[in-house]
Interface confidence: low
């Protein structure tokens, strides 16, 4: 039988009446154009909604926008457009919401052509009040908050000036001209690239990378011949043009650009690209594009310095620079990532790693599913997940995979079951163990979201027809109830719930439509009365993550330790609550070969835990450049996975010797770097 329709499914008692009492409709009193929604702060209940319209096929001449505010998680909204003097807000800049619970909001206004500069509206009290500020420049980008101090803002101007404010946008100062890209680093540091000759585009590959640690009082040039740069975890990366040709290489710094090392990654040509797929304080996943317009590349994983890389996955699907990749960090279980590979026959297959890129495998076939037409063997196939690439290809996939750190083990995604991703209409699958096993959760494409740290999953069918029904599950997607939230169906445009999945409120957004008038409408449903009581100790059960063989003493060991979690029983219908904290108990494991990645010059053949020498490097000395000195690597092929906590057990030899020889990439060596003050 279909999921949720067998006899085992107990119905939630009296849920229709409970939900009806907690369903709040709000009709927005304006024509429907586009809508953007932002949460202001965490657990504040404050939502800002900006509607803008400039509508063809409807008699409208001017763009107009309205601003609405809710302070009860979307149950009621107040039109606060007058607080921004009924100004047209530029949607391409969105609403710049301050970090953490600063309560800061910046809106960028549309101004008439001849004006000296742009205009912003600033709030520092969760959008209760706004101050209008005229800018001495026209912004090119959204205002960017310093992660450390929400009073510090930076923006680029349309004339490529870098502007900084130290008092939350009240006063602005241009600290540098000819700037292409600027980013906040840690400790209120700003990194930016500058051009010397024509423009950012013309100077690509000849840019300079600068740093200021005092908001523009003094500067240090930390790199030249720069193509681009990026920050990930504690690493600063720059792609740098080679001296002799048009190739470029990645250089990495862990000290804010004072010293650099060349990353042991292949160089790339003009048409290729590098991309940081994921980064934390331990390591980096780096994609290196293949030569030619192949649509794929190779994933490499770094050591703890970001310098030495191991090949992690071949033929990784990544279409073009800034294009589509399915690479997904499964945030509900440590070490798990999902992505797609392009096989030799040009079909796309999903791969998963449970050990941070050490080994990749196909996803296990869901037990309640049949292999589709793509499968050569009808009994042997796997689950393939639809993500960004499928969405970009306009397949019937309304949402990317979903996981939440506080909904341990839960992953929800659209997929198909076969030898490769299918273009047929997908179904929705769920894993409750971080991707090891999967079950078909819903037939056909749906929008979905997680509430109350996994205590409730909500879904809405993806349809071109108007809808009025929402589905919900209190047992991690095994059984589903349906609730009709309105008599008059609406054209559905999106589900909105507070980021972090701790809320019990869901907002359903859509519009009612006639040819000349179209109105936004939202329905906010509070599930608090469905989960009537707070969860108690008896509602939780002990779960060992990454468990594949309970008989094995090392069962559950991933990255050198295992973790036991307290997880809500599927049968318990209770509230985890907003203050729910994931309870976990780690324990250290003995080291095995699984705790080591293949070292520079080595790779792991498929389905083998041993690392073997790369044929092209056999018999060569393994030397690489570190902080401008040549290093010699003595290794039997293994290095500890960054972040791996194992102790004892297997201990492969690894030694790095300073060859006392100078080596330079074409990058500025530290002693040549210059500083200047304003």
């Amino acid at each position: 039988s279909a999921p949720g329709e067998d006899e085992e499914c107990g119905r939630v008692r009296d849920f229709v009446a409970k939900l009806a009492n907690n369903t709040h409709q709000h009709v927005f009193d304006d024509l429907r154009g586009s809508v953007s929604l932002s949460w202001v702060g965490d657990s504040t209940g404050v939502i800002l909604v900006l509607t803008t319209f400039h509508v063809p096929l409807v008699i409208m001449t001017f763009g107009q926008s309205k601003l609405y505010r809710s302070e009860d998680y979307g149950k009621n909204f107040k039109d606060i457009t007058d607080l921004i003097n009924n100004t047209f807000i530029r949607t391409e800049f969105g609403m710049a919401i301050g970090p953490e619970n600063s309560g800061k909001v910046v809106l960028t206004a549309e101004v008439s052509g001849g004006s000296r500069g742009g205009r912003i509206f600033r709030s520092s009290d969760f959008a209760k009040n706004f101050v209008q500020t005229d800018l001495p420049f026209h912004p090119l980008t959204q205002m960017m908050y310093s992660p450390q101090n929400s009073d510090y803002l930076l923006a680029l101007s349309t004339e490529n000036g870098l502007w900084v404010s130290k008092n939350f946008g009240g006063k602005w100062e241009e600290i540098h001209k000819a700037v292409c890209l600027a980013k906040w680093g840690s400790d209120n540091t700003i990194f930016f690239t500058t051009y010397a000759n024509g423009s950012c585009k013309a100077d690509l590959g000849a840019l300079e990378l600068w740093r200021t640690s005092d908001l523009g009082k003094s500067f240090k040039t930390i790199g030249v011949k720069i193509y681009s740069f990026g920050l990930g975890g504690r690493f600063l990366f720059a792609s740098v043009m080679a001296d002799k040709d048009t190739t470029r290489r990645i250089h990495v710094s862990t000290d804010q650009g004072d010293t650099w090392s060349m990353a042991q990654l292949p160089s790339v040509g003009q048409e290729q690209f590098y991309s940081i797929l994921a980064a934390n304080d331990d390591m980096v996943f780096m994609h290196v594009d293949e030569p030619g317009d192949t649509g794929f590349g190779t994933i490499f994983t770094s050591d703890d310095r970001g310098i030495v890389y191991s090949k992690s996955l071949d033929r990784h699907l990544y279409t073009t620079t800034g294009g589509e990749t399915d690479f997904t960090n499964v945030t509900s279980l440590r070490g798990v990532y999902i992505t797609s590979v392009l096989s030799e026959d040009n079909s796309i297959q999903t791969m998963i790693t449970f050990d941070q890129g050490g080994r990749w495998t196909h996803l296990r076939k869901p037990e309640n599913s049949e292999c589709d037409a793509t499968a050569k063997n009808k009994n042997e196939c796997s689950l393939h997940i639809h993500a960004s690439y499928s969405i970009s290809q306009k397949l019937n996939v309304p949402m990317a995979p979903l996981s939440e750190p506080n909904a341990v083990g839960i992953v929800i995604a659209h997929g198909s079951v076969g030898d490769a991703i299918s273009v047929m209409v997908p179904d929705v699958y769920i894993s409750d163990d971080g991707g090891y096993s999967w079950t078909k959760m819903l037939e056909g494409p749906h929008y979905y979201t997680i509430l109350d740290s996994g205590g409730i999953i909500v879904a809405i069918e993806h349809s071109s027809r108007p809808i009025n029904v929402i589905k919900f599950s209190t047992d991690e997607g095994q059984c589903w109830q349906t609730y009709t939230f309105t008599r008059d169906p609406i054209y559905f445009t999106g589900l909105a719930s507070e980021p972090g999945a701790r809320s019990m409120n869901i907002s359903i957004w859509g519009f009612t439509e006639s040819f000349l008038t179209s109105q936004w409408v939202s329905y906010t449903i509070d599930f608090k009365d469905i989960l009537e009581r707070n969860c108690e100790e008896k509602d939780y059960t002990i779960w060992l993550a990454h468990s594949t063989d309970p008989e094995d003493y090392e069962d559950g060991c991933i990255l050198g330790y295992k973790e036991q979690f307290l997880r809500l029983r599927k049968s318990s219908v209770c509230q985890n609550g907003r203050d729910y904290v994931v309870t976990k108990q780690p324990s250290i494991c003995l080291c095995s070969l699984e705790d080591f990645l293949c070292d520079f010059g080595y790779y792991r053949p498929e389905n083998d835990s041993k690392c073997v020498e790369q044929p092209e490097l056999k018999g060569h000395d393994l030397e690489f450049c570190l902080y401008g000195r040549e290093e010699h690597l003595t290794t039997n092929g293994y290095r500890k996975i960054p972040g791996d906590k194992c102790q004892g057990g297997v201990n492969p030899v690894r030694e790095v010797k300073d060859l006392k020889k100078k080596c330079t990439s074409n990058f500025l060596s530290p002693e040549k770097q210059n500083s200047k003050s304003n």
């Epitope: 586009s34 001449t61 054209y491 999106g494 000349l516």
Partner: antibody, heavy 124, light 106 residues
Framework: QVQLVQSGAEVKKPGSSVKVSCKAS????????ISWVRQAPGQGLEWMGG????????QYAQKFQGRVTITADESTSTAYMELSSLRSEDTAVYYC?????????????????WGQGTTVTVSS | DIQMTQSPSTLSASVGDRVTITCRAS??????LAWYQQKPGKAPKLLIY???SLESGVPSRFSGSGSGTEFTLTISSLQPDDFATYYC????????FGGGTKVEIK
């Protein structure tokens, strides 16, 4: 691939009406706007009106207001344009065209798919 | 209704020429403008939407620019297949077309 197939040529007497059909295949009919555009011999293009089949409400160019009726039947994925009180200057090729549109808000893509055209001749 | 004025109405050019057609709106239409190509006896074909976005499958020698009231369609290097009539069309209210520009062989 979306296709729009129109009904055949018509010869009409002045004062009568003509109803031209436009059948869509290979895509979601309801989420697009359908526009009707005509072209008199040797003349340029003239927009008559449009409809969003999923919503049923039509909009007409001022010039044709009261004389043209645009409807849609979702079940057959067909749009219709009926022009009444025909006169000789209504002799033209009548096209239906798909107007791209994003669910959730309008996003103008232009008329990206056209029917083959229906010749309507008004003559006594 | 917004009026769209296209110029020139006829344009003689040779293969390889750079061709520019202008379209002026009677009031600002932001970027809600499309360009079409039509050959005798055929339905129009969409080339450019939203003033400057190239429709998929259209050769890159076609480009559009402008916003507000002034718009241009440029063919960077005229090909034999490009001799046709070109129309602009606005969609900032009721839809209206320009009068057309016939590009003929010099």
């Amino acid at each position: 691939q979306v296709q729009l197939v129109q009904s055949g040529a018509e010869v009409k007497k002045p004062g009568s009406s003509v109803k031209v059909s436009c059948k869509a295949s290979g895509g979601t009919f309801s989420s697009y706007a359908i526009s009707w555009v005509r072209q008199a011999p040797g003349q340029g293009l003239e927009w008559m009106g449009g409809i969003i089949p999923g919503f049923g409400t039509a909009q007409y160019a001022q010039k044709f207001q009261g004389r043209v009726t645009i409807t849609a039947d979702e079940s057959t994925s067909t749009a219709y344009m009926e022009l009444s009180s025909l006169r000789s200057e209504d002799t033209a090729v009548y096209y239906c065209a798909r107007q791209g549109r994003k669910t959730g808000y309008y996003y103008y893509y232009g008329m990206d798919v056209w029917g083959q055209g229906t010749t309507v001749t008004v003559s006594s | 209704d917004i009026q769209m004025t296209q110029s020139p109405s006829t344009l003689s050019a040779s293969v390889g020429d750079r061709v520019t057609i202008t379209c002026r709106a009677s009031q600002s239409i932001s970027s809600w403008l499309a360009w079409y190509q039509q050959k005798p006896g055929k339905a129009p074909k969409l080339l450019i939407y939203k003033a400057s976005s190239l429709e998929s499958g259209v050769p890159s020698r076609f480009s559009g620019s402008g916003s507000g009231t002034e718009f241009t369609l440029t063919i960077s290097s005229l090909q034999p297949d490009d001799f046709a009539t070109y129309y602009c069309q606005q969609a900032d209210g009721h839809i209206t077309f320009g009068g057309g520009t016939k590009v003929e062989i010099k």
